[in-house]
């Protein structure tokens, strides 16, 4: 008998075609050869089974000898044998109907678990394979599972349930729910104002939840709550803000933080964290600050930076147009009775400029002059 | 919801062929079938025939047998129809429709944004 | 094939207006018939199938009916977006035939 597969909820079309291409009667039945549908002339009549409402026909293939049966909006117990009885002839179909969900929401944080469960009929033995965005392959029976979700990970899954050599193929969208970057560097010379931007990388109708910016100094021996806030529909509203220092937030995403000034006191890290609601856990995004400053006093031009630099920056002191004074893998370098002229700082890595300050030194009898 | 996306206007020659494609979105390729239907400008409309897009089984219009073809690619949700030996009078709006049967009939349920077809020398 | 000949072929009122469009088949089709609306530039759309029942989301103005030969689409009362063409299609047999189209203008 011929094996048919069908998705929970979709429609199914069984065909069941007679030797003569012309209207004559026909019936569909079960296995329990109760009557579903059939005709009466050009009329559909319909039997006493379980599909009433949801079976259909396709009159107009009649008049070709074809007699479909349609079931709509399937639900896995309508696995069954179809008979379909025509010409005193009985062809039979098979129906299996099996159904993919996602055990919990389709939309998840960053780190959690996905599970596929495979809903089949009794008797049936299927294989599942589904195929995530990124091209990975995850293989099983009745449940699958993936753990530690990545932002790669969002998109369309595809999975292929197969029985009898056939097989029926699901889509399941899922969002990951994550910040744009895990982490982020801002470099900024003192003085200048800081903007932390915190996109997100999944866009959903309402957004609702709250969030906390907790940063730790290099200075300091204890991290602190520097804000808090509410997100509600996307909007935001700053719940608690620190006064030193004063941060600004902006009131619709992406998340958007103004330091008004950049000072090394300010200088480390901090961590973003975003309680969704209706979501257990939290989305992580880490942001460091960098800062530097020029200074000369009397005899000596000094150039710092504080905050998290990697070990292969590089600190250079030099006089503009110049080869570097001074260039070292540390957090200061200075220069001990500088030339008259604009000097220049720069933070890099592998000769890129990450940050760059410029100060004036003036003939020794004059001040120094900050640009 | 249903979407039916089909492909932009298209201007041909006389003798030539035209592909139009109708991509579906926001329902699975399966239980209805895809129905072509034109309309020549200032006209009415002309039924011209159904692909299964599960299946792939065809029906035509009597009047087009032999110059239309309806295929379809189950990977995209994609249904093609492709008219050959173009005349002027082909020159229309041509759209995909997906059916809906209700008690043993098709309608015509969702419609594609239709695409012009204009055959000129 | 079944002709479907509406009547009128076209026709003006006012917003408020009841209005009723015919469409008579060359054989008999049940009620196995369907009106579709549509305004320039854009694709039909269904209203009224097997005869008499509305298309979901299509407003309780619109009413159909009709059975074997002869059909009836009427608009109890115009609304403004109301004025478009309508067609009837016959379901029954291939090949699928469409009246040549009433359009409802404004008066």
């Known amino acids: 008998k011929k094996v048919v597969l069908g998705k929970k909820g979709d429609t199914v079309e069984l065909t069941c075609t007679a030797s003569q291409k012309k209207s004559i009667q026909f019936h569909w039945k079960n296995s329990n050869q109760i009557k579903i549908l059939g005709n009466q002339g050009s009329f559909l009549t319909k039997g006493p089974s379980k599909l009433n409402d949801r079976a259909d026909s396709r009159r107009s293939l009649w008049d070709q000898g074809n007699f479909p049966l349609i079931i709509k909006n399937l639900k896995i117990e309508d696995s069954d044998t179809y008979i379909c009885e025509v010409e005193d002839q009985k062809e039979e179909v098979q129906l299996l109907v099996f159904g993919l969900t996602a055990n919990s929401d389709t939309h998840l944080l960053q780190g959690q678990s996905l599970t596929l469960t495979l809903e089949s009929p009794p008797g049936s033995s299927p294989s599942v394979q589904c195929r995530s965005p990124r091209g990975k392959n995850i293989q099983g029976g009745k449940t699958l599972s993936v753990s530690q979700l990545e932002l790669q990970d969002s998109g369309t899954w595809t999975c292929t349930v197969l029985q009898n050599q056939k097989k029926v193929e699901f889509k399941i969208d899922i969002v990951v729910l994550a910040f744009q970057k895990a982490s982020s560097i801002v470099y900024k010379k003192e003085g200048e104002q800081v903007e932390f931007s915190f996109p997100l990388a999944f866009t959903v109708e309402k957004l609702t939840g709250s969030g906390e910016l907790w940063w730790q100094a290099e200075r300091a021996s204890s991290s602190k709550s520097w804000i808090t806030f509410d997100l509600k529909n996307k909007e935001v509203s700053v719940k608690r803000v620190t006064q030193d220092p004063k941060l600004q937030m902006g009131k619709k995403l992406p998340l958007h933080l103004t330091l008004p000034q950049a000072l090394p006191q300010y200088a480390g890290s901090g961590n973003l964290t975003l309680a969704l609601e209706a979501k257990t856990g939290k989305l992580h995004q880490e942001v460091n600050l960098v800062v530097m400053r020029a200074t000369q006093l009397q005899k000596n031009l000094t150039c710092e930076v504080w905050g998290p630099t990697s070990p292969k920056l590089m600190l250079s002191l030099k006089l503009e147009n110049k080869e570097a004074k001074v260039s070292k893998r540390e957090k200061a370098v200075w220069v001990l009775n500088p030339e008259a002229g604009m000097w220049q700082c720069l933070l890099s890595d592998s000769g890129q400029v990450l940050l760059e300050s410029n100060i004036k030194v003036l003939p020794t009898w004059s001040t120094p002059v900050q640009p | 919801q249903v979407q039916l996306v089909q492909s932009g206007a298209e201007v041909k020659k006389p003798g030539a062929s035209v592909k139009v494609s109708c991509k579906a979105s926001?329902?699975?390729?399966?239980?209805?079938?895809m129905h072509w239907v034109r309309q020549a400008p200032g006209q009415g409309l002309e039924w011209m025939g159904w692909?299964?897009?599960?299946?792939?089984?065809?029906q035509y219009a009597q009047k087009f047998q032999g110059r239309v073809t309806m295929t379809r690619d189950t990977s995209t949700s994609t249904v093609y129809m492709e008219l050959s030996s173009l005349r002027s009078e082909d020159t229309a709006v041509y759209y995909c429709?997906?059916?809906?049967?209700?008690?043993?009939?098709?309608?015509?349920?969702?419609w594609g944004q239709g695409t012009l077809v204009t055959v000129s020398s | 094939d079944i002709q479907m000949t509406q009547s009128p072929s076209s026709l003006s009122a006012s917003v408020g207006d009841r209005v009723t469009i015919t469409c008579r088949a060359s054989?008999?089709?049940?009620?196995?018939l369907a009106w579709y609306q549509q305004k320039p530039g854009k694709a039909p759309k269904l209203l009224i199938y097997?005869?008499?029942s509305l298309q979901s989301g299509v407003p309780s103005r619109f009413s159909g009916s009709g059975s074997g030969t002869d059909f009836t689409l009427t608009i109890s009362s115009l609304q403004p977006e109301d004025f478009a063409t309508y067609y009837c299609?016959?379901?029954?047999?291939?090949?699928?035939?469409f009246g040549q189209g009433t359009k409802l203008e404004i008066k």
């Open positions: 429709a997906k059916d809906i049967v209700h008690d043993g009939t098709e309608y015509f349920q969702h």
């Open positions: 926001g329902s699975t390729f399966s239980g209805y079938y």
């Open positions: 692909i299964d897009p599960n299946g792939g089984g065809t």
């Open positions: 054989q008999n089709v049940n009620t196995w």
């Open positions: 097997e005869a008499s």
């Open positions: 299609q016959q379901a029954n047999s291939f090949p699928f035939t």
